[in-house]
């Protein structure tokens, strides 16, 4: 297993609709054709795999398990979007990248993106 650098933004604020997007960029030492991306959440004394996708370079990312994540890839960048977030989902979201094929296997883990989610205030009752 060889180490690889992964960069991601330090902080992202989710939209009022509970959507957060960030870019995960990895310094690929070679020409990987199969890449696996996993988003981990570290908070509340727990580590959770939020979503994971394996993709062939140039193809769309396919997430399993009715995923709340979507994403696209462009070169060594993965554009990740997490939706359906609520205030209690605030936490550190870490991007983990694995170059699966061809060998050698490379692993890179980012420092994490702190995603802040603020639940929208309910609309006040209208007099009209």
């Amino acid at each position: 297993c060889k180490a690889m650098h992964v960069a991601q933004p330090a902080v992202v604020l989710a939209s009022s609709r509970g959507i957060a997007s960030f870019v995960c960029e990895y310094a690929s030492p070679g020409k990987a054709t199969e890449v696996r991306v996993t988003v981990l959440r570290q908070a509340d004394s727990q580590v959770t795999e939020v979503c994971a996708a394996t993709y062939m370079m140039g193809n769309e990312l396919t997430f399993l398990d009715d995923s709340i994540c979507t994403g696209t890839s462009s070169g060594n960048q993965v554009n990740l979007t997490i939706q359906g977030l609520r205030a209690m989902d605030t936490g550190l979201y870490i991007c983990k990248v694995e170059l699966m094929y061809p060998p050698p296997y490379y692993l890179g883990i980012g420092n994490g993106t702190q995603i802040y989610v603020i639940d929208p205030e309910p609309c006040p009752d209208s007099d009209f």
Partner: nanobody, 125 residues
């Protein structure tokens, strides 16, 4: 309705390993998030680990990360908790639970609708 039955608990020495099993019947097993919780007498139930419906995603409490491993076999309707490097503080009743999902960034807070009767794990020093 889902019925859950745990097995595999017992008395072990500190540092030993153990595999807890949870057999499910009824319901569509492959659509449920499955979790393991533990509870010592007189204390609150504590989240240990959870696994997504297909088994591709997992979640662990920091206290067990790296020592415990959760897995599932949807064909056999089974969930497993491999526990290693056991410590006396791991002594608890371990419960298997099922939640309708879907998977979230905080599966410990899902509503677990179905629970097993628990299996006792006692770790002696």
């Amino acid at each position: 309705e889902v019925q859950l039955v745990e097995s595999g608990g017992g008395l072990v020495q500190a540092g030993d390993s153990l595999t807890l099993s949870c057999a499910a019947s009824g319901g569509t097993f492959s659509t449920y998030v499955m979790g393991w919780f533990r509870q010592a007498s007189g204390k609150e139930r504590e989240f240990v680990a959870a696994i997504s419906p297909s088994g591709t995603l997992t979640s662990y409490a920091d206290s067990v990360k790296g020592r415990f491993g959760i897995s599932r076999d949807n064909a056999k309707k089974m969930v497993y908790l491999q526990v290693s490097s056991l410590k006396p503080e791991d002594t608890d009743v371990y419960y298997c639970a099922a939640a309708r999902g879907p998977w979230t960034p905080r599966p410990s807070l899902l509503t677990y609708d179905y629970w097993g009767q628990g299996t006792q794990v006692t770790v002696s020093s």
